[in-house]
Amino acid sequence: QAEESPFVGNPGNITGARGLTGTLRCQLQVQGEPPEVHWLRDGQILELADSTQTQVPLGEDEQDDWIVVSQLRITSLQLSDTGQYQCLVFLGHQTFVSQPGYVGLEGLPYFLEEPEDRTVAANTPFNLSCQAQGPPEPVDLLWLQDAVPLATAPGHGPQRSLHVPGLNKTSSFSCEAHNAKGVTTSRTATITVLPQQPRNLHLVSRQPTELEVAWTPGLSGIYPLTHCTLQAVLSDDGMGIQAGEPDPPEEPLTSQASVPPHQLRLGSLHPHTPYHIRVACTSSQGPSSWTHWLPVETPEGVPLGPPENISATRNGSQAFVHWQEPRAPLQGTLLGYRLAYQGQDTPEVLMDIGLRQEVTLELQGDGSVSNLTVCVAAYTAAGDGPWSLPVPLEAWRPGQAQPVHQLVKEPSTPAFSWPHHHHHHHHHH
């Protein structure tokens, strides 16, 4: 049969509230060299136990009896400390354990989860969480909104999760936990009511450097909207901005709109350029969330200036005209140039030169027409830009280079058809 246990003192019991400090103690009497005392909690050796071992010899000889006392200190009682504690020693080839002592937790409820501050859109449902535990159990919860209980008694209303169907004003929520020992109150969470996200952001009108946009404001509870903020960002060929991406890839152009009306004219834009726009509206409580990015595009405009450095020289029945692209913004894709020339008593001749920047004209009547002047205009899909001032044809001087070009014969009548362009500014000079 087994040897008698060397334990002469067993761990006691500790029951208390969280944070309590206590000590468990066991004592044994052994003959010969004292063993190391280990502590078990629920059968598991405590590897990082805050324990101290004291050994007192009862005689002069090392082989005499020793009293060994081991003390386990529990510094701040937590739920994980609860359980059955025993001392364990290995003596020779035998193992001995003490009688168990118990550590229990009993006190006011302890919150595992408390309601958190958050922002919500007006009239939008949301949930709040609260969780508490004993011991002792059960723990019943009571929710309060703006310090007013939401149920007749603890445990009767919502428990771990409170569903709020929507708020129209900023409110506070807290949670009371009740058990047999008393009541603990959670932190108070402030739920800030922000305006709803604006809806139906759309274009009202488009101009090459200007977009007019409008939107429908969302509900904002009892707080009137103070303003809305519109952001525009170059689309960068669609890179980087997906429908829901929170931040633009570069610094956006930001404009504020007084409300109402829920409309804004965005100016100083580049013509014929894709943008993404979004809008958020603000009340005294803060801003709504942004709408998704809406892709928009400014239309093409007509060139803002005439072609530059026009030179026109005449050599008998031929005239050579050349020019450079307008320095002013084209406001679109340059599709070509129109040229008009006119003599003193002859009708004006209009020509579409295409994208070339020079032309040789074959003049009728062996060049006898006097006071010939030439005008040039650039055009885009949106139409013609301004015409240049009339440039008189100068007589060609020997030594002046004249490149050989395909001759453009003056037609017998000034009537032209424009196969690719159906809208033109008519010109007289």
Epitope: Q1, A2, S5, Q44, I45, E47, Q84, Q86, L88, V97
Partner: antibody, heavy 116, light 106 residues
């Protein structure tokens, strides 16, 4: 000397329950935890749970919670393991083992075969 | 749960050879335990608290290690040591075992 003697082999049908016993001798039965560990054919060891005979307190591996029940009869120093809703993958050797922070003594094992 | 991985899974060795079995834990633990299981027998405690020999275990067996890496060493292998060896931890619940290392004598 410490001894743990287990009941004999069992053959059960799927859905049935089995109850294995483990009789302890050679030490104060109520002072030490009794654990149950199983070993499927050709496999490793898997801890199922423990019982403290002195109080009847139990702790179970989450995997077996709801299917395993550990009990003791201190008057005859015997521990029991009952496993319910048996499946074919419960076919294994079931061991009881005394623990002192580890498993210092083991029973000889009980083969439970689950087959339809 | 803490996962214990033993290496090697299988080893064939000649008597008198020195054998080392390692056990790696998925998180740091304080103590390791080792068991020997011979065919058709129940496991037997070999090493407790990382380095202490269980009752009746020959001194050729030893254990060492800390943190996540632990070792069982058999200094001069004998024929009777043919068995499967398991490491085990109980630093956190549930207690878990390694997959085992089968030792065969050539």
């Amino acid at each position: 000397q410490v001894q743990l003697v287990q009941s004999g082999a069992e053959v059960k049908k799927p859905g049935a329950s089995v109850k294995v016993s483990c009789k302890a001798s050679g030490y104060p039965f109520t002072d030490f935890y009794i654990n149950w560990v199983r070993q499927a054919p050709g496999q490793g060891l898997e801890w199922m749970g423990w019982i403290y005979p002195g109080s009847g307190n139990t702790k179970y591996n989450e995997k077996f919670k709801g299917r395993v029940t550990l009990t003791v009869d201190t008057s005859i120093s015997t521990a029991y393991m009952e496993l319910s809703r048996l499946r074919s993958d419960d076919t294994a050797v079931y061991y009881c083992a005394r623990s002192t922070g580890f498993f210092d003594y083991w029973g000889q094992g009980t083969l439970v075969t689950v087959s339809s | 749960e803490i996962v214990l991985t033993q290496s090697p899974d299988f080893q064939s060795v000649t008597p008198k050879e020195k054998v080392t079995i390692t056990c790696s834990a998925s998180s740091s633990i304080g103590y390791m335990y080792w068991y020997q299981q011979k065919p058709d027998q129940s496991p037997k405690s070999l090493i407790y608290l990382t380095s202490n020999l269980a009752s009746g275990v020959p001194s050729r067996f030893s254990g060492s290690g800390s943190g996540t890496d632990y070792t069982l060493t058999i200094n001069s292998l004998e024929a009777e040591d043919a068995a499967t060896y398991y490491c085990q931890q109980w630093s956190s619940n549930p207690p878990t075992f390694g997959q085992g290392t089968k030792l065969e004598i050539k």
